[in-house]
Interface confidence: medium
């Protein structure tokens, strides 16, 4: 038997992936566990093997289909179970009735690129990945810029309250190396959370033009 508190958290990427984390105090050792997904109005079901991410935490990704296929809708409910093997049995360790579009976490934005860079400003664009067409333009973004001598945690957050896949960074220092990240969140969903941060994009501002007297 397993005692202790259990936490089972899952997010839908809006297309064909449900990512789950299960944590259990006083957890099992050397036991095979999986997440089982059973939709209420679909013919398919899916499982993934939970793999350890820490001493008392496991994670897995339910791959529901091709990355850009729309496998679930706003009316779907998916029963998600954590099943752990005990001898010949599969014991239910946790269960939730999962509403995919109330628990969204999109993939990190991709394809970051510098569109134009000057001495004091830089225009950067990006793309969203595997985001449902259901959102239309109902997305928001957060961005941050890493300045020399600072950490990401110290970087101020820039909020874009609309689906705008570009930004013009101002008041930058000439001839300086920066890094830039962006993340995305749908407006829909009671338990929806921000995507992971994108891979950092490194760029350098142009040097200031030399004065005539120098």
């Amino acid at each position: 038997a397993v005692n202790g508190t259990s936490q089972f958290t899952c997010f839908y990427n809006s297309r064909a992936n449900i990512s789950c984390v299960w944590s259990q105090d006083g957890a099992l050792q050397d036991t095979s566990c999986q997440v089982h997904a059973w939709p209420d109005r679909r013919r398919w079901n899916q499982t993934c093997e939970l793999l350890p991410v820490s001493q008392a935490s496991w994670a897995c990704n339910l791959i529901l289909g091709a990355p850009d296929s729309q496998k679930l809708t706003t009316v779907d409910i998916v029963t998600l179970r954590v099943l752990c093997r005990e001898g010949v049995r599969w014991r239910v360790m946790a269960i939730q009735d999962f509403k995919p579009f109330e628990n969204l976490r999109l993939m990190a934005p991709i394809s970051l690129q510098v569109v134009h860079v000057e001495t004091h400003r830089c225009n950067i664009s990006w793309e969203i990945s595997q985001a449902s067409h259901y959102f239309e333009r109902h997305l928001e973004f957060e961005a941050r810029t890493l300045s020399p001598g600072h950490t990401w945690e110290e970087a101020p957050l820039l909020t874009l309250k609309q689906k705008q896949e570009w930004i013009c960074l101002e008041t930058l220092t000439p001839d300086t190396q920066y890094e830039f990240q962006v993340r995305v969140k749908p407006l829909q969903g009671e338990f929806t959370t921000w995507s992971p941060w994108s891979q950092p994009l490194a760029f350098r501002t142009k040097p200031a033009a030399l004065g005539k007297d120098t």
Epitope: H36, D40, R89, W90, I95
Partner: nanobody, 123 residues
Framework: EVQLVESGGGLVQAGGSLRLSCAAS????????MAWFRQAPGKEREFVAS????????DYVDSVKGRFTVSRDNAKNTVYLQMNNLKPEDTAVYYC????????????????WGQGTQVTVSS
């Protein structure tokens, strides 16, 4: 493990109705498939009905289909067996059972059993 206490049994005339309840305590109720079994005098214990953890799937032995309804209230940690159009052959001790084995529905190998409640149907 979960502990189970049945109630609602009694004496009823043929054609009558009873509603059995099974209250669970001691563990996370929603993790368990719940079932009702019965044992008539001189006979082996037999499966009657079950309801999965989420409440989405129910199963019945053929002899009670259309007469008995199994349900659960996860907020109240309780499973019910509504028995209508009772017959004398339904007379038995009715047991509530719980199982965390996801693929185990009808087997007598359920993890946990209640003490049982007597149902007597007179003709």
């Amino acid at each position: 493990e979960v502990q189970l206490v049945e109630s609602g049994g009694g004496l009823v005339q043929a054609g009558g109705s009873l509603r059995l309840s099974c209250a669970a305590s001691g563990d996370v109720f929603v993790r368990y498939t719940m079932a009702w079994f019965r044992q008539a005098p001189g006979k082996e214990r037999e499966f009657v009905a079950s309801v999965t953890d989420s409440g989405r799937t129910t199963d019945y032995v053929d002899s009670v289909k259309g007469r008995f309804t199994v349900s659960r209230d996860n907020a109240k940690n309780t499973v019910y067996l509504q028995m209508n159009n009772l017959k004398p052959e339904d007379t038995a001790v009715y047991y509530c059972a719980a199982n965390t084995d996801y693929f185990q529905i009808r087997s007598l190998e359920f993890n946990t059993w209640g003490q049982g409640t007597q149902v007597t149907v007179s003709s």
